[in-house]
Amino acid sequence: TPLGPKWPEPVFGRLASPGFPGEYANDQERRWTLTAPPGYRLRLYFTHFDLELSHLCEYDFVKLSSGAKVLATLCGQESTDTERAPGKDTFYSLGSSLDITFRSDYSNEKPFTGFEAFYAAEDIDECQVAPGEAPTCDHHCHNHLGGFYCSCRAGYVLHRNKRTCSALCSGQVFTQRSGELSSPEYPRPYPKLSSCTYSISLEEGFSVILDFVESFDVETHPETLCPYDFLKIQTDREEHGPFCGKTLPHRIETKSNTVTITFVTDESGDHTGWKIHYTSTAQPCPYPMAPPNGHVSPVQAKYILKDSFSIFCETGYELLQGHLPLKSFTAVCQKDGSWDRPMPACSIVDCGPPDDLPSGRVEYITGPGVTTYKAVIQYSCEETFYTMKVNDGKYVCEADGFWTSSKGEKSLPVCEPVCGLSARTTGGRIYGGQKAKPGDFPWQVLILGGTTAAGALLYDNWVLTAAHAVYEQKHDASALDIRMGTLKRLSPHYTQAWSEAVFIHEGYTHDAGFDNDIALIKLNNKVVINSNITPICLPRKEAESFMRTDDIGTASGWGLTQRGFLARNLMYVDIPIVDHQKCTAAYEKPPYPRGSVTANMLCAGLESGGKDSCRGDSGGALVFLDSETERWFVGGIVSWGSMNCGEAGQYGVYTKVINYIPWIENIISDF
């Protein structure tokens, strides 16, 4: 019997009955064996077929076999109920080889032309399986010329049998106090040939409880205990299982904080697996009883290891551990069943003794010394000499532990000195310079620093003076010795103040006239206001109405007296304002340069002379009484005048303060 072509030769060709296309002879037997490469099959079809028809093709036939299996026995020209002719059918080998046998018997009733067939090798698609047959691969099948290969979904690995996908299901560690774990793909069938290990690892002190839930279906055997697939549960104390079958195992209270669950499957079966819900328990801690005026959160039926609660105090109460205030409080249950921290107290917020108010006092309204939540205190300023600035002085102890004003301010109110108070009243008469009495000029400041000069207290930490009086000290403010609260120039009983900074008007030019002869001294500390030390007021917008020609102003100082010496006691003089044109004219004749008197100056004195300020009075205030407010204000600053003080026809010249209110306010607000 001739052999067909052998691989690796190209596997394709033609087969025909002997003598084709002529009739075939009797008693013929011809066999062809076709072999394709591994992974290939053979395809065969007929282009001509004409054989004697006989019952079950017993006489003449073509038989197609693949291995031990007969694929077809063919005869006739067309198929009948019991015989088959190939017609347009294509035939495929089952493997890589195909046997074709042609046989004719001893006789033919008429001539038959036989057959012609063509064959070729083609790739087998191993991934295509007939319905009902097991799939080639567990997950993904990939066909290629001459073969195929399998691959797996993520989380699986190809078994060494190259077809099965084993689950990558080991090494999972559960550390939460409760959770769920299940067989891979649950509730779909679990994978074959897999070995899964799951660990539950909780902190020492916890005990794991396992509950099998929903369904349980693991391949089993009627006689042998779990020979195929099984589930085992291992703790440091004991082993539970193996488990298989369809019955949910009972709850397992492991009394252990670590559990290992092992699940092993074989190569066969179709079962849905299992699901475990695990919880944990521990020795409970004593139930936390909230302190008075506090509450526990969260509220639980019981608290076990790692459970925690916080204490929150009612508004107006604060957490205290012993005597120490806490920002927050959280206690954690420990493995021995005790809380890690003792219960705090919710103590009523105590704002503590209120701060002292400089130049003021505080009164307890709620009760003597009561400083707790909602307590009320009342600040007030020292009467007569201080007044409270934009505040009613009422403060309440709020929940944040701060005394808070009705406007929500936590800062103290401010006691501002009352300005312009004097023990002296003026009758409007002019009389000779005389000794001041205590409280007459409480704003009077003595400035020593090379020369003797004067100034006037503004607020409680500024001194208004003449620029020429402090010019030499502008860069060495600390050299100024500032004294107040005394009438006697040589008394040691003065209040000492020291300069922090000297601000000379930028328009003042030293030794070139006295325009803008104004300066401010900032004190390094606030002075205490009393009947002997009180600031002078700055002029109001309306002040010009009290400073018209012939209105009386008062100048005070320790300057030279008629005897030519500095006064030992503070002296004062009441003098009228002089018409500006008259004053300008008085200082236009030599030795005074033209323009000596400017619009920034005012003049005061008697035409007849004798009443004047003099050297040593420089920088002092020329004050006026505001009859509407009944407060004294500074209208002028002692600046300059004739060489001979009190000379007839000459006047004292003073810096006109009302022209400098913006300058004064800017400096005081900026510094």
């Epitope: 010795d481 006697k488 040589l490 008394s491 040691p492 009983h493 003065y494 000492q496 020291w498 030992r568």
Partner: antibody
Framework: QVQLVQSGAEVKKPGASVKVSCKAS????????MHWLRQAPGQGLEWIGD????????HYIEKFKDRATLTIDKSSSTAYMELSSLRSEDTAVYYC??????????????WGQGTLVTVSS | DIQLTQSPSSLSASVGDRVTITCSAS?????MYWYQQKPGKAPKLLIY???NLASGVPSRFSGSGSGTDNTLTISSLQPEDFATYYC?????????FGQGTKVEIK
């Protein structure tokens, strides 16, 4: 030269009064303040108060307000310090001292020699 | 009242030694004054306004400091300098003295 001469030592019984004098010379008495201080045996210095010799204005520290009286006699340029209701703890050397008038006015440039006052029953 | 604390309370030194006495105030003072007192005698002004030497006082005496800390220094101790030294302030009423520092012969 400038000098302050104090009166001699005194021994007094508790409850009694003592008056110590201090005569100034060598300067214009009324231009200065006269201060009084004391020093208990083995102790430091303690200020009592002062008087302005020009107008007799006085200042006392709180402790001595009710018991000390400072006076002057301009004609003799003498200052006096009287302490009443004496008790044993008033035993001390009492000094008069002139207040400076050149700078701060707050220190003592000339001192008397001191007067020992002993209070004993 | 401002408290003045002198240190040391006493010291032993030899002729020619440099001696420093400190006076610490309980709050800031502008000026400090120093006096020397010998046994049985009245105090004598040495230094005024912190650092100015009083009339007739030898230049070996000097004063320095500011705020709360002031110092009296004797650059080269002489036999006549063995005495008790006091600091005094009147920046704040009432005026107060230190407790004294006794300088003795070693």
């Amino acid at each position: 030269q400038v000098q302050l001469v104090q009166s001699g030592a005194e021994v007094k019984k508790p409850g009694a009064s003592v008056k110590v004098s201090c005569k100034a010379s060598g300067y214009t008495f009324t231009n200065y303040h006269m201060h009084w201080l004391r020093q208990a045996p083995g102790q430091g210095l303690e200020w009592i108060g002062d008087i302005d010799a020009s107008d007799s204005e006085t200042h006392y520290i709180e402790k001595f307000k009710d018991r000390a009286t400072l006076t002057i006699d301009k004609s003799s340029s003498t200052a006096y310090m009287e302490l009443s209701s004496l008790r044993s703890e008033d035993t001390a050397v009492y000094y008069c001292a002139r207040g400076d008038i050149t700078t701060t006015l707050r220190y003592f440039d000339v001192w008397g020699q001191g007067t020992l006052v002993t209070v004993s029953s | 009242d401002i408290q003045l604390t002198q240190s040391p309370s006493s010291l032993s030194a030899s002729v020619g030694d440099r001696v420093t006495i400190t006076c610490s105030a309980s709050s800031s003072v502008r000026y400090m004054y120093w006096y020397q007192q010998k046994p049985g005698k009245a105090p004598k002004l040495l230094i005024y306004d912190t650092s100015n030497l009083a009339s007739g006082v030898p230049s070996r005496f000097s004063g320095s400091g500011s705020g709360t800390d002031n110092t009296l220094t004797i650059s080269s101790l002489q036999p006549e300098d063995f005495a008790t030294y006091y600091c005094q302030q009147w920046s704040s009423y009432p005026l107060t003295f230190g407790q004294g520092t006794k300088v003795e012969i070693k």
